[in-house]
Every structure is written in structure tokens, then in C-alpha cells.
């Protein structure tokens, strides 16, 4: 008789999960030298062992401190880029400018990248069918409360100057319910942040509006303005001449706005 | 004891494709990278990639992207290196070669006996 | 990539003798570095890894020193069987790079 399986509304753990987590382990630290010292396997027993045999709603960011101590990394402070819902640019920028991070670009970040997983209470198998969606299940499964840990811990690592990619093409440019919007502008820490610079990415060609006058960018400047922080903004009318000029910034026509 | 064994000298044409294979024997096979390395007629040696069998990743040198697949058969404890759009600068010597440590592939205490590839019109 | 350079292209030593072999890195490669020895016809052999740490079986005469950028290869004293071509490799930054070899032959 098959055992009676939870069906969640979420997609189930992506495929061949433990082998991905392990490849992109050892990938990151053949190709990060300061992270040689990291054991992959101890990262990926400490990485299952935050959610197997967990009730997939009843994840805490306690599960995932082991695989916090095993990961931590030293990233420079003053060169972080945070992003929402423009990912996409976000990576293309810190593969150009190579001394900007994203949290993607650290190990945690990358291992998980794109990722699914979930396990079952009581048992040590992964399910692949299904996982819990945060709207429609619970926000305390595996992957949030992965995100939110590294994306909490990744804030307050912050310091001098903190930038982050917003996406202009959005209905709200700044969604206070985001990563971004719930963690991260929460997690800035003051004494050590001085700025927080927004970048709004306009996506229509002929779009010339000034964006950083969109009222949920003024929401965001409140925030982070009571909360002792300084908040810039700066238009990027043109995305592919913005990664060009990042590229290539002796290039004549990088003088005028992008 | 570890043993790599490695197939035939080919001889190919000038736009060709030439299949390696390296068989490996003495202990667990998937854990393991397996690189390649070649070594052109009087030359130095040269890293062009690795694969770890049962995660199924394959990196390879930016100089050889696009031109070489790596692959494992768990199977048969066997990896090839397919190397296609041959010239004649690829005549070489292709090594197979595995660290000690799992998972890891920095330096190279086992190697294949060698592959000869000759490409030649 | 980095780009290894090993000095001198060929060194000739009498049996008995020091031989000090040399390899730059274009870059810090920290201590990862390896040293390879290479018979003619045969695959390379595995000396030192991590600049300094004798591999299993190397015979106490080779001994590897460095960091950085400049790195040592030494075989205190040569035997028949150590005439050879020697290559450096770093493991520090992909791709791996290796020298381009140094060939020491008997005097």
C-alpha cells in the first residue's frame, strides 16, 4: 500500500538536487581560492540536514545555522549589490564589474540559486513531487527560510555605500513584500551603512521618465531614511548601454546619461 | 591500486572529431575528477577540463570551450574526452588524470599511459 | 589565466650535484603549486602539491619552497634517475596552468 504523501502547491525539489548542490560546491571552490578550506561534503550533510525529516512548514533559521558557520564567507562590505525582481541584470553586472557581489555570487547564494527543495517529517527521503508555496502553504518551508537567513546575514555584512537594482518596469518598482522589500532594507545596519543607492531599470526603450519619482521609490527613501540611512537614486534609461559602458567605460558615448 | 588505461593513437583528418576514452580500475570510480591534459609534440602540458562522474559536471578551459566534451559512463568506470574540429595544432599526446582526494581536482598523482592524436591531411 | 614561467629551459648538473629549479607565477597563486616529473615517453609523475608537501613515495632529496609568485624546486643530490623534464602547475585559478618545463640533463 503507498504511504499517504502531503501534496504541496509548490513545484517539487528540482531534480538530481543533491548532486547540484554538490557540484556547484565544488565548482565555487575551485574557483574562489580564499574558500578552499570548505569541505563540500560537510557542506551538503549540513545543508540536508537542515530540512530532512523537518515538517516542510516548520522550518526555522536555526535548522540552517551549521550550514551558515560552514559557509561563511568574507565578502567586502562596500561592494554589494542588492537587487528585486531583476536578477537577470543584476548577475550580468557583477560578472562584468567583478568586485561587486551579489549574494548569488557568494557560495551559500550560489549553491541555491534557482533551486527547489523540500523533505518530509519523520522520514529521510527528499520530495520530489512536491513543496510547499509560500502564498498558498506556509512561509516557513525550506527554501524562504533558506533565502531570508542568507539574505538577513548578506544585509548586515553591508557597509559605506549599498547599492540595489530595482526593476522600472514593475508595477510597484519597490514591493515592500520582496526579499528585498521584507529582509534586507531591514537588515542595513545603520552604523555601518552610510548610503543606500538605488539603480531603477527602465525596460521601454523610449521610457524617459524619472522613475526615482515613482511613489513606492519615495516609500523606500522613507524607510531607509528613518532608519538613519542616507538614499540616493539614479535612473538607467538604457540596460544594454549600461553593461556595454560598465564593460568598456573609456568608450566615448559612456560619457552622456545611460 | 589506481589504474588509468587509455584507448589507441588515432590518426584523424583536419575538421574531424577524435573520441578518448581512460578506463579507470583499483577503486571507486564516481567520486573522483577525471582531467585531461595534453601535451603537444615537445611541449608543455596543457589542462583542457574535468569531469566528475556522478554529479555529471564537466568544466573545461575557456581555450577548448565549445570544442571538447568531457563524459563518464559510471558504469564501466570509463571517461572520454571528445575533442572535434580538429587541426593540426591538436596533434598531441592526451593524458587522463585523478587527484586522491574525492570530488577535488587540483594536482595529479595517477595518470593514463596516453593517447597519441595525430591530425594530419 | 596565469601564465607559469620556469627558468632556466635546461639545466645541466653532475650526478651527486644540487639542482635548483625556478617557477614564477604571473599572478599570487598563494601555495598552490605542484611540481611534475616527466621521462620521455612516459605520463608525468606527481613530486610536490601544495608548494611544499612531498607526494606519497618522493624520495626525501626533492623538496619544494615558496608562495606567492616564486616557487623552488630542489633535488639536493642527483640521481641517474632524476634526469628528467620538471613542470610547475598552480592550481589557484582555473583554467590550471602549467609551465613550460625545465629539462635537466647530466653534465
Known amino acids: 500500500v503507498p504511504r499517504w504523501r502531503q501534496q504541496w502547491s509548490g513545484p517539487g525539489t528540482t531534480k538530481r538536487f543533491p548532486e547540484t548542490v554538490l557540484a556547484r560546491c565544488v565548482k565555487y571552490t575551485e574557483i574562489h581560492p580564499e574558500m578552499r578550506h570548505v569541505d563540500c561534503q560537510s557542506v551538503w550533510d549540513a545543508f540536508k540536514g537542515a530540512f530532512i525529516s523537518k515538517h516542510p512548514c516548520n522550518i526555522t533559521e536555526e535548522d540552517y545555522q551549521p550550514l551558515m558557520k560552514l559557509g561563511t564567507q568574507t565578502v567586502p562590505c562596500n561592494k554589494i549589490l542588492l537587487w528585486s525582481r531583476i536578477k537577470d541584470l543584476a548577475h550580468q553586472f557583477t560578472q562584468v564589474q567583478r568586485d561587486m557581489f551579489t549574494l548569488e555570487d557568494t557560495l551559500l547564494g550560489y549553491l541555491a540559486d534557482d533551486l527547489t527543495w523540500c523533505g518530509e517529517f519523520n522520514t529521510s527521503k527528499i520530495n520530489y513531487q512536491s513543496c510547499p508555496d509560500w502564498r498558498k502553504d506556509c512561509s516557513n518551508n525550506p527554501v524562504s527560510v533558506f533565502w531570508k537567513t542568507v539574505s538577513r546575514r548578506f544585509a548586515e555584512a553591508a557597509c559605506d555605500v549599498v547599492h540595489v537594482m530595482l526593476n522600472g518596469s514593475r508595477s510597484k518598482i519597490f514591493d515592500k513584500n520582496s526579499t528585498f522589500g521584507s529582509v534586507e532594507v531591514h537588515n542595513l545596519q545603520p552604523e555601518k551603512v552610510q548610503t543606500l543607492e538605488a539603480w531603477v531599470i527602465h525596460g521601454g526603450r523610449e521610457d524617459s521618465r524619472d522613475l526615482c519619482q515613482d511613489p513606492t521609490i519615495k516609500e523606500l527613501e522613507s524607510i531607509i531614511s528613518k532608519r538613519n540611512i542616507q538614499f540616493s537614486c539614479k535612473n538607467i534609461y538604457r540596460p544594454d548601454k549600461f553593461l556595454q559602458c560598465v564593460k568598456n567605460p573609456e568608450d566615448s558615448s559612456c560619457t552622456s546619461e545611460i | 591500486q589506481v589504474q588509468l588505461v587509455q584507448s589507441g593513437a588515432e590518426v584523424k583528418k583536419p575538421g574531424s572529431s577524435v573520441k578518448v576514452s581512460c578506463k579507470a580500475s583499483?577503486?571507486?570510480?564516481?567520486?573522483?575528477?577525471i582531467n585531461w591534459v595534453r601535451q603537444a609534440p615537445g611541449q608543455g602540458l596543457e589542462w583542457m577540463g574535468r569531469?566528475?562522474?556522478?554529479?555529471?559536471?564537466?568544466n573545461y578551459a575557456q581555450k577548448f570551450q565549445g570544442r571538447v566534451t568531457i563524459t563518464a559512463d559510471e558504469s564501466t568506470s570509463t571517461a572520454y574526452m571528445e575533442l572535434s574540429s580538429l587541426r593540426s595544432e591538436d596533434t598531441a599526446v592526451y593524458y587522463c588524470?585523478?587527484?586522491?582526494?574525492?570530488?577535488?581536482?587540483?594536482?595529479?598523482?595517477?595518470w593514463g599511459q596516453g593517447t597519441l592524436v595525430t591530425v594530419s591531411s | 589565466e596565469i601564465v607559469m614561467t620556469q627558468s632556466p629551459a635546461t639545466l645541466s648538473v653532475s650526478p651527486g650535484e644540487r639542482a635548483t629549479l625556478s617557477c614564477r607565477a604571473s599572478?599570487?597563486?598563494?601555495?598552490?603549486l605542484a611540481w611534475y616529473q616527466q621521462k620521455p615517453g612516459q605520463a608525468p609523475r606527481l613530486l610536490i602539491y601544495?608548494?611544499?608537501t612531498r607526494a606519497t613515495g618522493i624520495p626525501a632529496r626533492f623538496s619544494g619552497s615558496g608562495s606567492g609568485t616564486e616557487f623552488t624546486l630542489t633535488i639536493s643530490s642527483l640521481q641517474s634517475e632524476d634526469f628528467a623534464v620538471y613542470y610547475c602547475?598552480?592550481?589557484?585559478?582555473?583554467?590550471?596552468?602549467f609551465g613550460q618545463g625545465t629539462k635537466v640533463e647530466i653534465k
Open positions: 588524470a585523478r587527484a586522491t582526494s574525492p570530488l577535488y581536482s587540483y594536482y595529479f598523482d595517477y
Open positions: 583499483g577503486d571507486y570510480f564516481n567520486n573522483y575528477a
Open positions: 569531469i566528475i562522474p556522478f554529479l555529471d559536471d564537466a
Open positions: 599572478q599570487s597563486v598563494s601555495s598552490n
Open positions: 601544495g608548494a611544499s
Open positions: 602547475q598552480q592550481y589557484n585559478n582555473w583554467p590550471w596552468t
